[in-house]
C-alpha cells in the first residue's frame, strides 16, 4: 500500500518566499512520520524535512542550507521556504515515510510542484535625472 | 565563533511583564530552532519554550503556557521571549540556547551566559 500525495502543480514565489502544502491520503496524527522536500527531477537534493513523533515537538531542519520551516495537519504538511533564489526555479516533489505503527509505509511519487521564483527587481536609476532644484 | 547575548532581565513585581531578547551571531540563525530554559536559583535547568526555525511552531512548557510568548526576527538573528503575569515561581536565570540541527528540541550545543529575571515585592 502506498500513500498518495497531492500537490499544487505551479506556486510563484515573488518575495523570495513560498507555501508548499502536501496533502497526504493518510492521517499523520499519533505517527511516528517523516516528511522532505526535494529538489528536481530526480528528487536529488532534500530541501527540508519535518519529523514527527508522536506528541513530541516536530523536527525541522534542511541540510542543504535552505531556509525552512514545517506545519503539521492531520493529513498535510506544509512547507515554509524563505531566501529563496531565481535559479532555486525547479520541480519540487513531496516525500512522506510513516515508521510507526507498522507497516513501514511511503508515498507512490507525486506529480510534483514547479516553484518559479521571481527576482526582486529593483527600478534603474534613471541615466538623466532632472535638473536639481535650488 | 558562535555567540549568544541574553538582555532584558531584571526586578519585577508579580503580575509584572518583561521582554527578554538573544542576540545570536556566528551562525546561519534561520537555519536552527531556538529554545528558552531557565535555571531557578538551587534548582536543574527546565526547559520553557522552543521555536522552529521561521517561526511556524511554538513550544511551551506547561508552567508557562498562556503566559509567555517566543518569537524571532531572522532578519535581525534575534530570538525574543515576552514573559507576562509573572510569579515568584519564575524567579531564574533564563538562558537562549540553539539546537543541535536535526536532533529535535532539548539538544544544545551552545547556549548564552544568562539573564537574571528576579519577581519579587
Known amino acids: 500500500n502506498k500513500i498518495l500525495v497531492k500537490q499544487s502543480p505551479m506556486l510563484v514565489a515573488y518575495d523570495n518566499a513560498v507555501n508548499l502544502s502536501c496533502k497526504y491520503s493518510y492521517n499523520l496524527f499519533s505517527r511516528e512520520f517523516r516528511a522532505s522536500l526535494h529538489k528536481g527531477l530526480d528528487s536529488a537534493v532534500e530541501v527540508c524535512v519535518v519529523y514527527g513523533n508522536y506528541s513530541q515537538q516536530l523536527q525541522v531542519y534542511s541540510k542543504t542550507g535552505f531556509n525552512c520551516d514545517g506545519k503539521l495537519g492531520n493529513e498535510s504538511v506544509t512547507f515554509y521556504l524563505q531566501n529563496l533564489y531565481v535559479n532555486q526555479t525547479d520541480i519540487y516533489f513531496c516525500k512522506i515515510e510513516v515508521m510507526y505503527p507498522p507497516p513501514y509505509l511511503d508515498n507512490e511519487k507525486s506529480n510534483g510542484t514547479i516553484i518559479h521564483v521571481k527576482g526582486k527587481h529593483l527600478c534603474p536609476s534613471p541615466l538623466f535625472p532632472g535638473p536639481s532644484k535650488p | 565563533e558562535v555567540q549568544l547575548l541574553e538582555s532584558g532581565g531584571g526586578l519585577v513585581q508579580p503580575g509584572g511583564s518583561l521582554r527578554l531578547s538573544c542576540a545570536a551571531s556566528?551562525?546561519?540563525?534561520?537555519?536552527?530552532?531556538m529554545e528558552w530554559v531557565r535555571q531557578a536559583p538551587g534548582k536543574g535547568l527546565e526547559w520553557v519554550s522552543s521555536?522552529?526555525?521561521?517561526?511556524?511552531?511554538?513550544y511551551y512548557a506547561d508552567s508557562v503556557k498562556g503566559r509567555f510568548t517566543i518569537s524571532r526576527d531572522n532578519s535581525r538573528n534575534t530570538l525574543y521571549l515576552q514573559m507576562n503575569s509573572l510569579r515568584a515561581e519564575d524567579t531564574a536565570v533564563y538562558y537562549c540556547?540553539?539546537?543541535?540541527?536535526?536532533?529535535?528540541?532539548?539538544?544544545?550545543?551552545?547556549w548564552g551566559q544568562g539573564t537574571l529575571v528576579t519577581v519579587s515585592s
Open positions: 521555536i522552529t526555525p521561521l517561526g511556524a511552531n511554538t
Open positions: 540556547a540553539k539546537d543541535i540541527r536535526y536532533t529535535g528540541t532539548y539538544n544544545f550545543d551552545y
Open positions: 556566528g551562525f546561519t540563525f534561520p537555519g536552527y530552532t
